[in-house]
Protein backbone atom coordinates (compact mmCIF):
# COMPACT_ATOMS: atom_id res chain seq x y z
CA UNK A 1 0.00 0.00 0.00
CA UNK A 2 1.42 3.62 -1.06
CA UNK A 3 1.10 7.02 -1.53
CA UNK A 4 -0.03 8.36 -4.75
CA UNK A 5 -0.40 12.16 -4.09
CA UNK A 6 0.60 13.05 -0.98
CA UNK A 7 -2.04 14.70 1.60
CA UNK A 8 -2.53 18.36 0.77
CA UNK A 9 -4.56 20.43 3.45
CA UNK A 10 -6.50 23.62 3.94
CA UNK A 11 -7.82 25.00 7.14
CA UNK A 12 -11.24 27.26 7.74
CA UNK A 13 -9.52 29.01 10.30
CA UNK A 14 -11.51 28.13 12.60
CA UNK A 15 -12.29 24.41 13.85
CA UNK A 16 -11.46 21.96 10.86
CA UNK A 17 -8.56 21.33 8.21
CA UNK A 18 -9.55 19.06 5.59
CA UNK A 19 -6.66 17.11 4.04
CA UNK A 20 -7.09 15.09 0.75
CA UNK A 21 -4.90 12.30 -0.42
CA UNK A 22 -4.57 9.65 -3.15
CA UNK A 23 -3.74 6.17 -2.68
CA UNK A 24 -2.12 3.97 -5.10
CA UNK A 25 -4.90 1.73 -5.27
CA UNK A 26 -8.76 1.36 -4.04
CA UNK A 27 -8.64 1.61 -0.31
CA UNK A 28 -11.25 1.38 2.36
CA UNK A 29 -10.01 4.76 4.23
CA UNK A 30 -12.06 4.25 7.18
CA UNK A 31 -10.52 0.90 8.16
CA UNK A 32 -7.09 0.77 6.85
CA UNK A 33 -5.73 4.41 7.64
CA UNK A 34 -5.34 6.39 10.26
CA UNK A 35 -3.84 10.26 9.56
CA UNK A 36 -2.57 11.18 12.91
CA UNK A 37 -1.82 14.97 14.11
CA UNK A 38 -0.02 16.52 16.53
CA UNK A 39 0.53 20.28 17.23
CA UNK A 40 4.14 21.98 17.64
CA UNK A 41 3.87 22.80 20.95
CA UNK A 42 4.95 22.03 24.02
CA UNK A 43 3.21 19.12 26.19
CA UNK A 44 0.80 18.71 23.39
CA UNK A 45 -0.30 15.23 22.53
CA UNK A 46 -0.90 13.64 19.42
CA UNK A 47 -4.67 13.22 18.12
CA UNK A 48 -6.28 11.04 15.23
CA UNK A 49 -8.43 11.43 12.47
CA UNK A 50 -9.80 8.48 10.91
CA UNK A 51 -10.54 9.03 7.29
CA UNK A 52 -13.34 8.46 4.57
CA UNK A 53 -13.51 7.63 1.22
CA UNK A 54 -13.13 10.73 -1.81
CA UNK A 55 -13.76 8.47 -4.99
CA UNK A 56 -11.91 4.62 -5.22
CA UNK A 57 -8.37 5.58 -3.94
CA UNK A 58 -9.08 8.66 -2.89
CA UNK A 59 -9.33 9.71 1.26
CA UNK A 60 -10.67 12.67 2.98
CA UNK A 61 -9.75 13.52 7.10
CA UNK A 62 -11.47 16.35 8.76
CA UNK A 63 -9.25 17.74 11.56
CA UNK A 64 -10.96 18.75 14.10
CA UNK A 65 -8.82 22.15 16.17
CA UNK A 66 -9.91 24.03 18.89
CA UNK A 67 -9.27 27.11 16.93
CA UNK A 68 -6.23 28.93 14.86
CA UNK A 69 -3.43 31.05 15.52
CA UNK A 70 -0.93 32.14 12.93
CA UNK A 71 2.11 30.04 14.77
CA UNK A 72 0.25 27.22 14.57
CA UNK A 73 2.25 23.93 12.94
CA UNK A 74 1.08 20.73 12.64
CA UNK A 75 2.98 17.33 12.62
CA UNK A 76 1.31 14.50 9.88
CA UNK A 77 1.60 11.27 9.97
CA UNK A 78 -0.40 8.84 7.76
CA UNK A 79 -0.64 5.24 9.03
CA UNK A 80 -1.56 1.89 7.83
CA UNK A 81 -1.71 -0.44 10.80
CA UNK A 82 1.85 -0.09 12.29
CA UNK A 83 3.51 1.23 8.66
CA UNK A 84 4.42 4.92 8.39
CA UNK A 85 3.10 5.34 4.51
CA UNK A 86 4.24 9.22 4.81
CA UNK A 87 5.04 12.24 6.99
CA UNK A 88 4.80 15.89 6.87
CA UNK A 89 3.43 19.55 8.25
CA UNK A 90 1.13 21.61 7.60
CA UNK A 91 0.77 25.46 8.59
CA UNK A 92 -3.03 26.31 8.80
CA UNK A 93 -2.42 30.05 8.38
CA UNK A 94 -0.36 29.63 5.23
CA UNK A 95 -3.51 27.19 3.70
CA UNK A 96 -7.22 28.75 4.29
CA UNK A 97 -9.57 28.24 2.85
CA UNK A 98 -12.56 30.31 4.28
CA UNK A 99 -16.12 29.12 5.24
CA UNK A 100 -18.95 29.59 2.62
CA UNK A 101 -21.34 32.43 3.73
CA UNK A 102 -24.39 31.78 4.50
CA UNK A 103 -28.32 33.04 4.54
CA UNK A 104 -27.86 34.70 1.15
CA UNK A 105 -31.64 36.55 1.01
CA UNK A 106 -32.45 39.40 -1.68
CA UNK A 107 -34.83 41.86 -1.22
CA UNK A 108 -36.59 43.11 -3.88
CA UNK A 109 -39.10 45.64 -2.12
CA UNK A 110 -36.96 48.64 -2.07
CA UNK A 111 -37.99 51.12 -4.86
CA UNK A 112 -36.28 49.26 -7.55
CA UNK A 113 -33.15 48.17 -5.98
CA UNK A 114 -32.00 44.54 -5.55
CA UNK A 115 -30.64 44.19 -1.58
CA UNK A 116 -28.93 40.71 -1.41
CA UNK A 117 -27.96 40.29 2.62
CA UNK A 118 -25.66 37.32 3.61
CA UNK A 119 -24.22 36.18 6.79
CA UNK A 120 -20.29 36.28 7.81
CA UNK A 121 -19.90 32.86 7.93
CA UNK A 122 -17.25 33.37 11.23
CA UNK A 123 -18.35 34.60 14.77
CA UNK A 124 -16.69 38.65 15.50
CA UNK A 125 -14.03 37.17 17.47
CA UNK A 126 -12.38 35.44 14.85
CA UNK A 127 -9.39 37.24 12.77
CA UNK A 128 -11.24 36.31 9.96
CA UNK A 129 -14.35 37.81 10.55
CA UNK A 130 -13.10 41.45 9.87
CA UNK A 131 -11.46 40.52 6.76
CA UNK A 132 -13.45 38.93 4.77
CA UNK A 133 -14.72 40.54 1.20
CA UNK A 134 -17.03 38.83 -1.25
CA UNK A 135 -17.99 37.80 -4.59
CA UNK A 136 -21.86 37.33 -5.77
CA UNK A 137 -22.22 36.13 -8.79
CA UNK A 138 -25.65 36.77 -10.12
CA UNK A 139 -27.11 34.89 -13.43
CA UNK A 140 -29.97 34.12 -15.66
CA UNK A 141 -31.56 30.91 -15.58
CA UNK A 142 -32.95 31.52 -19.22
CA UNK A 143 -30.17 32.97 -20.87
CA UNK A 144 -26.21 31.25 -19.72
CA UNK A 145 -24.93 34.41 -20.97
CA UNK A 146 -26.72 36.69 -18.65
CA UNK A 147 -23.52 36.05 -15.92
CA UNK A 148 -22.33 38.29 -13.51
CA UNK A 149 -19.74 38.76 -10.73
CA UNK A 150 -20.06 41.73 -8.60
CA UNK A 151 -16.99 41.94 -6.39
CA UNK A 152 -17.58 43.53 -2.91
CA UNK A 153 -14.40 44.73 -1.77
CA UNK A 154 -15.63 46.98 1.73
CA UNK A 155 -16.61 43.96 4.72
CA UNK A 156 -20.00 44.70 5.08
CA UNK A 157 -21.98 41.66 3.60
CA UNK A 158 -24.22 42.86 1.59
CA UNK A 159 -24.57 44.47 -2.06
CA UNK A 160 -27.11 47.05 -3.46
CA UNK A 161 -27.72 47.09 -7.59
CA UNK A 162 -30.15 48.79 -9.32
CA UNK A 163 -33.37 45.88 -10.32
CA UNK A 164 -32.89 47.65 -14.08
CA UNK A 165 -29.32 46.51 -14.39
CA UNK A 166 -30.87 43.10 -14.91
CA UNK A 167 -33.66 42.45 -17.23
CA UNK A 168 -37.46 42.23 -16.13
CA UNK A 169 -40.04 39.59 -15.94
CA UNK A 170 -37.60 36.71 -15.35
CA UNK A 171 -35.74 34.32 -12.77
CA UNK A 172 -32.23 35.19 -11.68
CA UNK A 173 -30.29 33.28 -9.00
CA UNK A 174 -27.51 34.62 -6.74
CA UNK A 175 -24.86 32.93 -4.83
CA UNK A 176 -21.96 34.38 -2.57
CA UNK A 177 -18.25 33.10 -1.75
CA UNK A 178 -15.47 34.86 0.26
CA UNK A 179 -12.02 35.57 0.59
CA UNK A 180 -9.40 37.20 2.69
CA UNK A 181 -6.33 39.16 1.68
CA UNK A 182 -4.60 38.75 4.81
CA UNK A 183 -3.93 35.51 4.49
CA UNK A 184 -3.74 34.97 0.75
CA UNK A 185 -6.36 32.27 1.00
CA UNK A 186 -8.53 30.66 -1.37
CA UNK A 187 -11.70 31.25 -2.90
CA UNK A 188 -14.84 29.42 -0.36
CA UNK A 189 -17.02 27.71 -1.93
CA UNK A 190 -20.22 28.96 -2.98
CA UNK A 191 -22.86 29.87 -0.58
CA UNK A 192 -26.01 28.00 -1.37
CA UNK A 193 -27.99 30.01 -4.04
CA UNK A 194 -31.37 31.95 -3.84
CA UNK A 195 -33.82 32.73 -6.66
CA UNK A 196 -36.42 35.44 -6.97
CA UNK A 197 -38.52 37.19 -9.92
CA UNK A 198 -36.74 40.08 -11.27
CA UNK A 199 -39.49 43.33 -12.24
CA UNK A 200 -39.38 46.38 -12.22
CA UNK A 201 -41.51 49.57 -13.36
CA UNK A 202 -40.09 50.61 -16.92
CA UNK A 203 -39.50 53.94 -16.99
CA UNK A 204 -41.63 56.40 -18.38
CA UNK A 205 -40.33 57.58 -21.75
CA UNK A 206 -41.31 60.99 -22.25
CA UNK A 207 -41.71 62.15 -26.00
CA UNK B 1 -10.29 20.11 46.64
CA UNK B 2 -7.42 19.96 44.29
CA UNK B 3 -4.71 18.41 45.87
CA UNK B 4 -1.41 16.60 45.46
CA UNK B 5 0.35 15.49 47.68
CA UNK B 6 4.06 13.72 47.26
CA UNK B 7 6.44 11.27 49.00
CA UNK B 8 9.36 9.04 48.64
CA UNK B 9 11.98 11.82 49.57
CA UNK B 10 15.10 10.72 52.06
CA UNK B 11 18.68 10.48 52.42
CA UNK B 12 20.53 8.81 50.09
CA UNK B 13 24.30 8.53 48.73
CA UNK B 14 25.87 9.67 45.75
CA UNK B 15 25.30 7.40 43.16
CA UNK B 16 22.22 5.60 44.20
CA UNK B 17 18.53 5.85 43.76
CA UNK B 18 14.74 7.11 44.87
CA UNK B 19 11.78 7.27 43.77
CA UNK B 20 9.42 9.92 44.35
CA UNK B 21 5.42 9.75 44.00
CA UNK B 22 2.50 12.46 43.62
CA UNK B 23 -0.72 11.45 44.04
CA UNK B 24 -3.41 13.81 42.26
CA UNK B 25 -6.82 14.23 44.05
CA UNK B 26 -10.12 16.52 42.66
CA UNK B 27 -9.27 16.41 39.24
CA UNK B 28 -9.59 14.34 36.32
CA UNK B 29 -5.59 13.71 36.26
CA UNK B 30 -5.18 11.90 32.86
CA UNK B 31 -6.50 15.44 31.16
CA UNK B 32 -3.00 17.23 32.34
CA UNK B 33 -0.09 17.40 32.17
CA UNK B 34 2.43 17.04 35.52
CA UNK B 35 5.49 18.67 36.26
CA UNK B 36 8.45 18.34 39.01
CA UNK B 37 10.10 21.88 39.87
CA UNK B 38 13.16 21.88 42.76
CA UNK B 39 14.36 23.86 45.17
CA UNK B 40 18.05 23.56 46.68
CA UNK B 41 18.41 24.79 49.64
CA UNK B 42 18.69 28.26 50.36
CA UNK B 43 18.49 28.93 46.16
CA UNK B 44 15.54 29.49 43.30
CA UNK B 45 12.91 27.46 42.09
CA UNK B 46 14.89 24.96 39.24
CA UNK B 47 12.49 23.06 36.48
CA UNK B 48 13.09 19.46 36.45
CA UNK B 49 10.38 17.35 34.06
CA UNK B 50 7.11 17.37 32.48
CA UNK B 51 4.94 14.76 31.61
CA UNK B 52 1.85 15.13 29.10
CA UNK B 53 -1.44 13.63 29.95
CA UNK B 54 -1.16 10.51 28.24
CA UNK B 55 2.83 9.71 28.97
CA UNK B 56 3.30 10.52 25.51
CA UNK B 57 5.48 13.44 25.71
CA UNK B 58 8.46 13.97 28.09
CA UNK B 59 11.05 17.23 28.44
CA UNK B 60 13.48 17.01 30.65
CA UNK B 61 16.38 19.35 32.22
CA UNK B 62 19.97 19.19 30.85
CA UNK B 63 20.98 18.68 34.68
CA UNK B 64 18.89 15.43 35.06
CA UNK B 65 18.82 14.06 31.68
CA UNK B 66 19.70 10.37 31.26
CA UNK B 67 19.13 10.06 35.12
CA UNK B 68 15.97 10.85 35.95
CA UNK B 69 12.80 9.13 34.54
CA UNK B 70 9.08 10.93 35.00
CA UNK B 71 6.24 8.85 34.62
CA UNK B 72 2.75 8.27 35.53
CA UNK B 73 -0.08 5.71 36.15
CA UNK B 74 -3.30 7.65 35.21
CA UNK B 75 -4.98 4.35 36.88
CA UNK B 76 -3.46 5.24 40.00
CA UNK B 77 -3.65 8.92 39.73
CA UNK B 78 0.24 9.27 40.23
CA UNK B 79 2.91 10.62 38.77
CA UNK B 80 6.68 9.42 39.63
CA UNK B 81 10.15 10.55 39.81
CA UNK B 82 12.45 7.96 39.47
CA UNK B 83 16.00 9.06 39.90
CA UNK B 84 19.53 7.42 39.54
CA UNK B 85 22.62 7.89 39.51
CA UNK B 86 22.41 10.68 42.35
CA UNK B 87 24.50 13.50 43.06
CA UNK B 88 25.11 15.77 46.12
CA UNK B 89 23.95 18.77 43.89
CA UNK B 90 20.47 17.22 43.76
CA UNK B 91 20.11 17.67 47.20
CA UNK B 92 16.57 19.72 47.47
CA UNK B 93 12.90 20.01 47.94
CA UNK B 94 11.15 18.20 45.01
CA UNK B 95 7.65 19.47 44.05
CA UNK B 96 5.38 18.32 41.58
CA UNK B 97 2.93 20.55 39.93
CA UNK B 98 -0.47 20.28 38.12
CA UNK B 99 0.43 21.36 34.56
CA UNK B 100 -1.71 22.45 31.36
CA UNK B 101 -4.68 21.03 29.60
CA UNK B 102 -3.03 18.40 27.67
CA UNK B 103 -5.87 16.94 26.02
CA UNK B 104 -6.92 19.70 23.96
CA UNK B 105 -5.76 19.98 20.60
CA UNK B 106 -3.99 23.32 21.62
CA UNK B 107 -3.10 22.94 25.56
CA UNK B 108 -4.76 25.08 27.22
CA UNK B 109 -2.65 26.66 29.86
CA UNK B 110 -3.49 27.89 33.00
CA UNK B 111 -0.35 28.11 35.07
CA UNK B 112 1.41 25.78 37.67
CA UNK B 113 -1.74 25.99 39.44
CA UNK B 114 -1.68 23.41 42.08
CA UNK B 115 1.41 22.45 44.07
CA UNK B 116 2.40 19.57 46.74
CA UNK B 117 4.08 20.23 50.05
CA UNK B 118 7.63 19.14 48.80
CA UNK B 119 9.72 16.32 49.11
CA UNK B 120 12.84 16.52 50.70
CA UNK B 121 15.44 14.87 49.10
CA UNK B 122 19.04 15.01 50.50
CA UNK B 123 22.22 13.18 49.03
CA UNK B 124 24.92 13.23 51.04
CA UNK B 125 27.51 10.33 52.11
CA UNK C 1 17.32 28.64 26.89
CA UNK C 2 15.37 31.49 27.32
CA UNK C 3 16.87 33.16 30.26
CA UNK C 4 14.68 35.23 32.89
CA UNK C 5 16.08 38.37 34.40
CA UNK C 6 13.97 39.66 37.41
CA UNK C 7 14.92 43.05 38.82
CA UNK C 8 15.18 44.64 41.86
CA UNK C 9 16.09 41.06 43.84
CA UNK C 10 15.07 42.79 46.90
CA UNK C 11 12.31 45.10 47.35
CA UNK C 12 11.74 47.05 50.97
CA UNK C 13 8.05 48.54 50.80
CA UNK C 14 6.36 50.58 53.06
CA UNK C 15 2.22 48.67 53.99
CA UNK C 16 -0.11 50.64 51.47
CA UNK C 17 2.49 51.77 48.99
CA UNK C 18 2.67 49.68 45.34
CA UNK C 19 5.36 47.76 44.41
CA UNK C 20 6.36 46.22 40.67
CA UNK C 21 8.82 43.55 40.28
CA UNK C 22 10.17 43.50 36.52
CA UNK C 23 11.29 40.33 34.39
CA UNK C 24 12.58 40.35 31.01
CA UNK C 25 13.01 37.25 28.79
CA UNK C 26 16.14 36.64 26.49
CA UNK C 27 13.64 35.32 23.72
CA UNK C 28 10.11 36.40 23.20
CA UNK C 29 7.69 34.17 24.98
CA UNK C 30 4.57 35.30 22.83
CA UNK C 31 2.94 32.39 21.05
CA UNK C 32 0.25 34.32 19.67
CA UNK C 33 -1.52 37.50 20.66
CA UNK C 34 -2.99 37.59 24.45
CA UNK C 35 -0.89 34.35 24.50
CA UNK C 36 2.34 35.54 26.35
CA UNK C 37 3.85 31.78 28.13
CA UNK C 38 5.07 34.10 31.64
CA UNK C 39 3.26 33.11 34.94
CA UNK C 40 4.54 35.01 38.32
CA UNK C 41 4.78 32.90 41.58
CA UNK C 42 4.98 33.62 45.27
CA UNK C 43 7.06 31.66 47.61
CA UNK C 44 6.22 32.66 51.36
CA UNK C 45 8.49 31.29 54.00
CA UNK C 46 8.43 27.83 54.56
CA UNK C 47 5.99 27.01 52.05
CA UNK C 48 5.21 25.78 48.41
CA UNK C 49 5.02 28.26 45.54
CA UNK C 50 1.18 29.76 44.54
CA UNK C 51 0.48 30.91 41.31
CA UNK C 52 -0.78 34.44 41.17
CA UNK C 53 -0.97 35.18 37.35
CA UNK C 54 -0.77 32.82 34.12
CA UNK C 55 -0.23 34.12 30.65
CA UNK C 56 1.16 37.34 31.26
CA UNK C 57 -1.84 38.89 32.61
CA UNK C 58 -4.30 36.32 34.07
CA UNK C 59 -5.05 36.69 37.57
CA UNK C 60 -5.28 32.75 39.08
CA UNK C 61 -8.48 31.95 41.00
CA UNK C 62 -8.26 33.21 44.73
CA UNK C 63 -5.32 35.70 43.83
CA UNK C 64 -6.46 39.14 45.07
CA UNK C 65 -7.31 42.32 42.48
CA UNK C 66 -4.37 43.90 44.10
CA UNK C 67 -1.72 41.69 42.14
CA UNK C 68 -1.79 42.53 38.57
CA UNK C 69 0.25 41.82 35.55
CA UNK C 70 1.42 43.45 32.36
CA UNK C 71 3.82 43.30 29.31
CA UNK C 72 4.23 41.06 26.36
CA UNK C 73 6.95 39.38 24.11
CA UNK C 74 10.01 40.13 26.76
CA UNK C 75 8.92 42.12 28.90
CA UNK C 76 6.70 41.85 32.28
CA UNK C 77 5.85 43.49 34.90
CA UNK C 78 3.85 42.18 38.67
CA UNK C 79 2.47 45.10 40.27
CA UNK C 80 1.05 45.57 43.52
CA UNK C 81 -1.12 48.14 44.22
CA UNK C 82 -0.60 47.94 47.70
CA UNK C 83 1.59 45.70 50.15
CA UNK C 84 -0.09 43.97 52.52
CA UNK C 85 2.14 42.60 55.20
CA UNK C 86 1.28 38.66 54.05
CA UNK C 87 2.50 39.87 50.59
CA UNK C 88 6.20 39.10 51.84
CA UNK C 89 8.11 36.17 50.55
CA UNK C 90 10.12 35.38 46.96
CA UNK C 91 8.61 36.49 43.93
CA UNK C 92 9.23 34.96 40.87
CA UNK C 93 8.75 34.99 37.29
CA UNK C 94 8.70 31.51 34.80
CA UNK C 95 8.54 30.86 31.05
CA UNK C 96 6.64 27.92 29.64
CA UNK C 97 6.39 28.36 26.41
CA UNK C 98 9.50 26.13 25.33
CA UNK C 99 11.32 23.55 27.41
CA UNK C 100 13.14 23.95 29.88
CA UNK C 101 10.84 26.00 31.67
CA UNK C 102 13.09 28.74 33.15
CA UNK C 103 12.25 30.92 36.17
CA UNK C 104 13.70 34.05 37.51
CA UNK C 105 16.11 34.93 40.22
CA UNK C 106 13.31 35.78 42.60
CA UNK C 107 12.94 39.09 44.42
CA UNK C 108 12.92 39.21 48.07
CA UNK C 109 9.69 41.32 49.32
CA UNK C 110 10.19 42.78 52.70
CA UNK C 111 7.95 45.05 54.69
CA UNK C 112 10.27 48.19 55.53
Known amino acids: MKVLQEPTCVSDYMSISTCEWKMNGPTNCSTELRLLYQLVFLLSEAHTCIPENNGGAGCVCHLLMDDVVSADNYTLDLWAGQQLLWKGSFKPSEHVKPRAPGNLTVHTNVSDTLLLTWSNPYPPDNYLYNHLTYAVNIWSENDPADFRIYNVTYLEPSLRIAASTLKSGISYRARVRAWAQCYNTTWSEWSPSTKWHNSYREPFEQH | EVQLVESGGGLEQPGGSLRLSCAGSGFTFRDFAMTWVRQAPGKGLEWVSSISGSGGNIYYADSVKGRFTISRDNSKNTLYLQMNSLRAEDTAVYYC??????????????????WGQGTTVTVSS | DIVMTQSPLSLPVTPGEPASISCRSSQSVLYSIGYNYVDWYLQKSGQSPQLLIYLGNKRASGVPDRFSGSGSGTDFTLKISRVEAEDVGFYYCMQSLTSPYTFGQGTKLEIK
Open chain 2, 97 to 114: AKDRLSKTIRPRYYGLDV
